[in-house]
């Protein structure tokens, strides 16, 4: 028998469903009786879900797991993990036993977007140029951590003076807040741009100085 | 009929290496998953490893883990055991048995293997 | 790592009577659980597998009765040959493949 999975990760987002695909090659006059299925944490080897016995035992993961019953015996042990979580990130493992045995490892990988970037100035008023100004960039309940990225209104990157802090909140999603200082000029404008890597998601936000009053 | 026989055992000290062979016939080798038990003098039995039809995955027992090596040629209908760093616990016979819906239905006569200085 | 614990560790019975052996998971194994005989000097040889079924050739005095994590091998009338050290193996969640301690059922 010969396990197959997806050898790139499984990207899913966040609260939404996720198949992790296994198969195997049934052999001639192969019935589920014969089939012992086993999903577990590769790393742990927590189970997961398991079918043996010519039944499906169940979840044995927050009881959001299901199997494909009705395609099993066609060599489908796929498996759908519903409302994905933060913590459901890593390496699972497909394992099959029959006459023969196999297993293989998939990897899910777990994201959510970023929210369009907020954007606050300090101090917010009586600019001048040649003021010292502290610009925030905040975009919240993003996973995994961001990229942040700020250029100034000619597309220059600003690296120098730039404090980017990420903190997960309680359901492993991050809230990021990245703090350009720089010195005005007669005006500008500064954008910042806060990247998801594994979604290759791009959210934007910019504050243009013109004097008085402030564009965002 | 199904025939599993074993070789290469011996007497090695500590620290040295040995590798068992088992040969099979009488079935179709690359369809059935292969595996070592062995049995120290007077004791019970010890699930050692395993390897899958096709050669691609393995398990071992955590008494052997890093040290043994099981292997298969299906062109040979041979199964191997490479057994390095061999210790006194190492001690006991050998067998070889087939794998079949996770029981063991075929085994083979043993070889033993002594590791003493 | 499932444990599967074998009792009596010896059992003294009389050729023509019945015997009755015990295997105990740590877990459950469902039905998934083999037995084993081996006689001295001899490899084991499969007796049951599935909790109750026999393998080929096994003679119907010995039937297999269980499931989940208590089960029982029974030898309903000893012969000469039958006296010997059974095993019991779990299948059900591996590696590792586990054995029990086995039984050794001697000659009264």
């Known amino acids: 028998v010969e396990v197959q999975v997806s050898e790139d990760p499984v990207v899913a987002l966040v609260d939404t469903d996720a198949t992790l695909r296994c198969s195997f090659s049934p052999e001639p006059g192969f019935s589920l009786a014969q089939l012992n299925l086993i999903w577990q944490l590769t790393d742990t080897k927590q189970l997961v879900h398991s079918f043996t016995e010519g039944r499906d035992q169940g979840s044995a993961y927050s009881n959001r797991t299901a199997l494909f019953p009705d395609l099993l015996v066609q060599g489908n042990a796929s498996l759908r993990l519903q409302r994905v979580r933060v913590t459901d990130e890593g390496s699972y493992t497909c394992f099959v036993s029959i006459q023969d045995f196999d297993s293989a490892a998939v990897s899910l990988q777990v994201a959510a977007p970023y929210s369009k970037p907020s954007m606050t100035l300090e101090p917010n008023k009586d600019l001048r140029p040649g003021n010292m100004v502290t610009i925030t960039c905040s975009s919240y309940q993003g996973y995994p951590e961001a990229e942040v990225f700020w250029k100034d209104g000619q597309g220059v990157p600003l690296t120098g003076n730039v404090t980017t802090s990420q903190m997960a909140n309680e359901r492993g999603l991050f809230d990021v807040h990245s703090v350009l200082r720089v010195v005005l000029g007669a005006n500008g404008t500064y954008s910042c741009l806060v990247r998801n890597p594994v979604l290759q998601q791009d959210a934007h936000g910019s504050v243009t100085i013109t004097g008085q009053p402030l564009t965002f | 009929d199904v025939q599993l026989v074993e070789s290469g055992g011996g007497v090695v000290r500590p620290g040295e290496s040995l590798r068992l062979s088992c040969a099979a016939s009488?079935?179709?080798?690359?369809?059935?998953?292969e595996s070592w038990v062995r049995q120290a003098p007077g004791e019970g039995l010890e699930w050692v490893s395993i390897?899958?039809?096709?050669?691609?995955?393995?398990f071992y027992a955590d008494s052997v883990k890093g040290r043994f090596t099981i292997s298969r040629d299906n062109s040979k209908n041979t199964l191997y055991l490479q057994m390095n760093s061999l210790r006194a616990e190492d001690t006991a016979v050998y067998y070889c048995?087939?794998?079949?819906?996770?029981?063991?239905?075929?085994w083979g006569l043993g070889t033993l293997v002594t590791v003493s200085s | 790592e499932i444990v599967l614990t074998q009792s009596p560790g010896t059992l003294s019975v009389s050729p023509g009577e019945g015997a009755t052996l015990s295997c105990r998971a740590s877990?459950?194994?469902?039905?998934?659980l083999a037995w084993y005989q081996q006689k001295p000097g001899q490899p084991p040889s499969l007796l049951i597998y599935?909790?109750?079924t026999r393998a080929t050739g096994i003679p119907d005095r010995f039937s297999g009765s269980g499931s989940g994590t208590d089960f029982t091998l029974t030898i309903s009338s000893l012969q000469s040959e039958d006296f010997a050290v059974y095993y019991c193996?779990?299948?059900?969640?591996?590696?590792?493949?586990?054995f029990g301690g086995g039984t050794k059922v001697e000659i009264k």
């Open positions: 048995a087939r794998f079949a819906y996770g029981f063991f239905d075929y």
């Open positions: 009488g079935f179709t080798f690359s369809s059935y998953a």
């Open positions: 390897i899958s039809g096709s050669g691609g995955n393995t």
């Open positions: 877990q459950t194994v469902g039905s998934k």
């Open positions: 599935d909790a109750s």
């Open positions: 193996q779990q299948y059900r969640n591996w590696p590792p493949l586990t």
